[in-house]
Each structure stands twice: as C-alpha cells, then as structure tokens.
C-alpha cells in the first residue's frame, strides 16, 4: 500500500493565549503531509491546513465562533505526492487531540499597565483591556468583554525606596489605591480567573514605576 511509510501524528497539543489558538503535533514530516480537522462535540468536521508540511495549524478562526464550546481536532497523515492514498482500513491514518474548551483553558496573556495617575494621596492604575480575536457583531471583543466578572486583576505595588509590597484586587480594569505623598511607587499586575482550576493566572506585567513616562501627577 502507498501508506507504508506514513506515520500517525502524535503529541497533539493545544497552544492558546487570549484565544489565539494553535494545534501543534509531531513528528516533522518525512515524505508525508498533514491535514487537520476540527469540530465541536456535536458538530461536523471542518478541514483546515490542507496537505501541509507544517506541524502546527492555527485554529483561532474556528474556536472563536463559540469560545465556550468544547472542541476536538484530528490530524490526518498522507503520503507526500499521493494524498488520495488511504490506510489499510480504507481511510487515512489520523490521531485525535485532547478536548479543548477555550473559555476554560486559554492562557491569560501577560497584561500591560496602560497608565497611572496620581491625585494627592490616591493613584489610579489602569490595565490595558487587551483585544482578542473573538468577534461579536463584526467587532473584536476585549478580554473583559469575553470574561466579564470572571476576570479579575491583582495589583502588586511598593515604594521604590523599600521592599515591602502591598496588593489589591479589582473586577474592573482599574485600581484606586492609597499612597504616601511624596513617595514614588512601582506597580505590576496579574490577570486571574478565580473560577478556573487550570491556567488561572497570567504572568506578571512589566513593572512600571512613578517618575517614568506612563504616569501623570496632579496635586
């Protein structure tokens, strides 16, 4: 048969951050090509990345149609130059991915502090509301649009002159914190989805400190 040297894909892995979702697998192809199919549990299979020599396939466009659905993908292996060929059972060799539910599993990307503004002894710290590739009514939704109150942010802040840290939480994208007048502070934020059991926290944002460009000061 023409499939003698065709091997099934293995180590199928979902890589997803802020809903940008790529399926990766092994091995690097030798004399074979791959096609990926994706479906929801109850839906039809849709083919993507036809006859590719890549070992990854961007499935973002499919999963953003409904991020709360659970998806399954499969990777078909075909002999290079003979993609009509089938395996001994009469169909191409393929391997299933683990199930993937974007809303519950996509990694939270590193957040960014958009700005901070001091007014007297209060500082308002604003977290950038990152745009995702999830669409509604032809517009891209932000992370907050998608997750709503399921998404919180944790702020870490400390005086530039000391190591003692404080923390605050918000269910919006803004913090209003008390500071000592005349002191400079540094800030870092982290995104959290407390209801999750996996991929609950993002990495910390880059640290931003008062006395640098992002801030504004008013008496």
């Amino acid at each position: 048969s023409g499939t003698t040297n065709t091997v099934a894909a293995y180590n199928l892995t979902w890589k997803s951050t802020n809903f940008k979702t790529i399926l990766e697998w092994e091995p690097k192809p030798v004399n074979q090509v791959y096609t990926v199919q994706i479906s929801t549990k109850s839906g039809d299979w849709k083919s993507k990345c036809f006859y590719t020599t890549d070992t990854e396939c961007d499935l973002t466009d499919e999963i953003v149609k409904d991020v709360k659905q659970t998806y399954l993908a499969r990777v078909f292996s075909y002999p290079a130059g003979n993609v009509e060929s089938t395996g001994s059972a009469g169909e191409p060799l393929y391997e299933n991915s683990p199930e993937f539910t974007p809303y519950l599993e996509t990694n939270l990307g590193q957040p960014t502090i958009q700005s901070f503004e001091q007014v007297g002894t209060k500082v308002n710290v604003t977290v950038e509301d990152e745009r995702t590739l999830v669409r509604r009514n032809n517009t891209f939704l932000s992370l907050r649009d998608v997750f709503g109150k399921d998404l919180i942010y944790t702020l870490y802040y400390w005086k530039s002159s000391s190591s003692g840290k404080k923390t605050a939480k918000t269910n919006t994208n803004e913090f209003l914190i008390d500071v000592d007048k005349g002191e400079n502070y540094c800030f870092s934020v982290q995104a959290v989805i407390p209801s999750r059991t996996v991929n609950r926290k993002s990495t910390d944002s880059p640290v931003e400190c008062m006395g640098q460009e992002k801030g504004e000061f008013r008496e």
């Epitope: 923390t167 605050a168 939480k169 918000t170």
Partner: antibody
Framework: QVQLLESGAVLARPGTSVKISCKAS????????MHWVKQRPGQGLEWIGG????????MYDPKFQGRVTITADTSTNTAYMELSSLRSEDTAIYYC??????????WGQGTLVTVSS | DIQMTQSPSSLSASVGDRVTITCKAS??????LSWYQQKPGKAPKLLIY???SLADGVPSRFSGSGSGTDYTLTISSLQPEDIATYYC?????????FGGGTKVEIK
C-alpha cells in the same frame, strides 16, 4: 482532593524564631496565593500576610512586618511562615489558607505555637 | 487600611429563626468579601465567596448579599449545627482584614 497539612505544635522560648510549614496536595500552589492567619486563644482571626508562589511576591500586615517571612517552595508544593523575636502574645494557632482570588477557600488544620520561658 | 465592622458580636436565636449578620467596610471593597464559619477547635470553613456565591457543599439556607461597603450573611432557618462563630473577610486590598466575629447561640 485539596488538602493543606501543617507542621506540628511548637513550644518556643521568647526571643527565638519558629518556622511553620504547610504542605499542599490536590493542587499546585503556583496557581493560587497562600496566606497565614493568626488566632489567639478565645480571640478572632488576624491576617498575618500572604505570598504568590508563582512570582515570590509577599505581603504582610504592618503589625508583623519585619518579624515575619512568608515563602514557598514550589518544588515541594509547600508554603512556609517564619516568625522571629517571639513574645508571649505570639502564643496562638497559626493557619495557612489557599486564596483562589475569590476567597480563602481551603484552610490547614492549624499549628499551635506556645511561647514560654 | 480597610476596617471591617461586624455586627452583632453575639446573638441568640431559636431553631428555625432567620438570622442576619452584617459587615461594613470603611471603603468600597468591590465584592471581595467572604464569610466563614468556625466551630470550637476547628479551622474556619468557607461559606460564601465573592459576597454572594455559595461555596461547594454549604447548605442553601446560607446566603450572602451586598456590594460596595455593606454586606450581609443570612441564615434563613437556623439549625442546631449552625452554632458557631462567623467571620467576614475583606481581601480586596492588603492588609486583608477580618470582622470581629459573631457568636451564634441557640435560645
């Protein structure tokens, strides 16, 4: 299932230090925040401080700042609290607790620390 | 620092009574408030998280309400096993602060 197992009761002399451990199972401490709470006999609950094991950030109540150090060892999935310069008013039960972001949802059984000469 | 004022400090009620405990924060804590039940010699147990959500395995007679600075724990029909001390906790900002506790007894 989720469990927090604290180290055993300690009798310590005034002026010395004590280090209590809290071994987590059923979850990865890096995915949560870990806190320590003090309860003196017959009294209410008092937050000592907390730690984010993923990045090492630790926060303390100013009342304890300088005397307490909260750390975590992600390789053993264990949180620690060290309290130094012990005095009689440190005699208490010390609880570790997991913070999900919404609440301290799981607590250790408590470690009794008795400070006496 | 945020102060949490919990009231009453103790109460006595009959089995089947509706019991209400309140916590008032000195500033907006954005629903980062949880309620705990503690029985003698035991660790605190989570009842309510995020101000209004019932924790797993907690009887439905317990409920939480409130937002901003004012929060309430309600036991709709007091049962003998509810004899305990109840605490609120704000964790919206460090230092985290507990209310002073409410000791609930049966008449």
């Amino acid at each position: 299932q989720v469990q927090l197992l604290e180290s055993g009761a300690v009798l310590a002399r005034p002026g010395t230090s004590v280090k209590i451990s809290c071994k987590a199972s059923g979850f990865n401490i890096k995915d949560y925040y870990m806190h320590w709470v003090k309860q003196r006999p017959g009294q209410g609950l008092e937050w000592i401080g907390g730690n984010d094991p993923a990045n090492g950030h630790s926060m303390y109540d100013p009342k304890f700042q300088g005397r307490v150090t909260i750390t975590a060892d992600t390789s053993t999935n264990t949180a620690y609290m060290e309290l130094s310069s012990l005095r009689s008013e440190d005699t208490a039960i010390y609880y570790c607790a997991r913070d999900s972001g919404y609440a301290m949802d799981y607590w250790g059984q408590g470690t009794l620390v008795t400070v006496s000469s | 620092d945020i102060q949490m004022t919990q009231s009453p400090s103790s109460l006595s009620a009959s089995v089947g009574d509706r019991v209400t405990i309140t916590c008032k924060a000195s500033q907006d804590i954005k629903s980062f408030l949880s309620w705990y039940q503690q029985k003698p010699g035991k660790a605190p147990k989570l009842l309510i998280y995020y101000a209004t959500s019932l924790a797993d395995g907690v009887p439905s007679r317990f409920s939480g309400s409130g937002s901003g600075t004012d929060y309430t724990l309600t036991i709709s029909s007091l049962q003998p096993e509810d004899i305990a001390t109840y605490y609120c906790l704000q964790h919206g900002e460090s230092p985290y602060t507990f209310g002073g506790g409410t000791k609930v007894e049966i008449k």
